[in-house]
Amino acid sequence: DVERTTCPPEKEVHEIDESLIFYKKRELEACVDAALLAAQMDRVDAIPFTYEQLDVLKHKLDELYPQGYPESVIRHLGHLFLKMSPEDIRKWNVTSLETLKALLKVSKGHEMSAQVATLIDRVVVGRGQLDKDTVDTLTAFCPGCLCSLSPERLSSVPPSVIGAVRPQDLDTCGPRQLDVLYPKARLAFQNMSGSEYFVKIRPFLGGAPTEDVKALSQQNVSMDLATFMKLRREAVLPLTVAEVQKLLGPHVEGLKVEEQHSPVRDWILKQRQDDLDTLGLGLQGGIPNGYLILDLSVREALS
């Protein structure tokens, strides 16, 4: 903490301007009135303060707003945003997308993923749902940031907004997030024709259940291996060799290259070797001929 001193009369601050860059830390602490700082926050970013000086300014704002900064201050934080921790941001209530844009621009090129994730979370909470304007802002200013939201927050996305989401926006989404987004995408694209539907649904398929993957195998979609590898393991394991062959079409030969990677490896172990041999790819590790497969999980479920 900055030690308290009295402000020398000649150093008294009546407005936030460039002269403050010559103030020592203790002088800033003693001479800058927090309310004045808050009122003139729009000037701060244009002044080349050192990181040490910014620490003092943050400290002043923290004292003035212990419950969290108002949006009028947040909007003009500029480089002061780089000093904020996720704990600081959690106290905020942000509704303006202009505020979000301004802070996303500042954070670019800095290691601030936790802060940005918390900021986006606060915006979604402040606006009540993840609406189209918010999604558009995220995709434009922070590709991949959509996936920083929790599944609970993503559940507030209306299906009508899904069309604004691009494949690269989903690149960092985990299975739980795709579990939430997939049914919304399915609903959003349900009236499209087969090939157009597949192009649109492809980035969301990491959340698809087995029955939907089986259905796709009947539609000559020729799924590429990159998409197949992103499917849930649980969705892939029940597929038969014939279904996988239909699903992948000409891409089926890629199974050989990926045979050591999950979910391909796990799927191979569940297939009869005879069936795998029909693919002519030299896939090994299937269940040998003459072996009986006992599904003990069924018995356990009944007992």
Epitope: L225, A226, M229, E253, V257
Partner: antibody, heavy 119, light 108 residues
Framework: EVQLVQSGAEVKKPGASVKVSCKAS????????MDWVRQAPGQGLEWMGD????????IYNQKFNGRVTMTEDKSTSTVYMELSSLRSEDTAVYYC????????????WGQGTTVTVSS | EIVLTQSPDFQSVTPKEKVTITCSAS???????LSWYQQKPDQSPKLLIY???NLASGVPSRFSGSGSGTDFTLTINSLEAEDAATYYC?????????FGGGTKVEIK
């Protein structure tokens, strides 16, 4: 433009570890595996293993098992290759190379990172 | 593991001449799973041919590939000065992936 940019040259002592990074840009990071290939001075190419950035799943050449670890960071589209218990024979140029999932050929290569192991 | 043996190890050729490099596998390779790379001094390797005979993007048509089973060939129809490099075959038909020992082509 598709690019793979690797970290700079390293000089290490025997027994130490080295971690090389490879930052990808210009394409969908999770649609391609990243493989690592090394080349000892005046020698040919040797495949070390690969990582699927989508799942984080790895396959290593058994020759390096226990010594090599490949990891990824989707948020920065970066993959890492760490080789431990270094010996003089590990002196080589280490390349990351992009491989479309479902194919086995490397269509884009990093510029290479020279690792020198010397006491 | 599949061992790929290239021959010759070294070839000194005059411009416009035809160059043939062979790659012999210790066991059968699915032809979809063989490729060729070109590496010039102090440069990273560059993909030339994939799936035995498909030319990679931007590769001149004087390069071609053929073969099946255990024997594969890279041909440069009319050698140019810029083709001086080391050429490697590569298989991904079985783990671990392997490369041939390389063939160095020098311009006379």
């Amino acid at each position: 433009e598709v690019q793979l940019v690797q970290s700079g040259a390293e000089v290490k002592k025997p027994g130490a570890s080295v971690k090389v990074s490879c930052k990808a840009s210009g394409y969908t990071f999770t649609d391609y595996n990243m493989d690592w290939v090394r080349q000892a001075p005046g020698q040919g190419l040797e495949w070390m293993g690969d990582i699927n950035p989508s799942t984080g799943g790895t396959i290593y050449n058994q020759k390096f098992n226990g010594r090599v670890t490949m990891t990824e960071d989707k948020s920065t589209s970066t993959v890492y290759m760490e080789l431990s218990s270094l010996r003089s024979e590990d002196t080589a140029v280490y390349y990351c190379a992009r491989r479309r999932i479902g194919t086995g050929y490397f269509d884009v290569w990093g510029q290479g990172t020279t690792v020198t192991v010397s006491s | 593991e599949i061992v790929l043996t290239q021959s010759p190890d070294f070839q000194s050729v005059t411009p416009k001449e035809k160059v043939t490099i062979t790659c012999s596998a210790s066991s059968s390779v699915i032809s979809s799973y063989l490729s060729w790379y070109q590496q010039k001094p102090d440069q990273s390797p560059k993909l030339l041919i994939y799936r035995t005979s498909n030319l990679a993007s931007g590769v001149p048509s004087r390069f071609s590939g053929s073969g099946s089973g255990t024997d594969f060939t890279l041909t440069i129809n009319s050698l140019e000065a810029e083709d001086a490099a080391t050429y490697y075959c590569h298989q991904w038909s079985s783990f671990p992936y392997t490369f041939g020992g390389g063939t160095k082509v020098e311009i006379k």
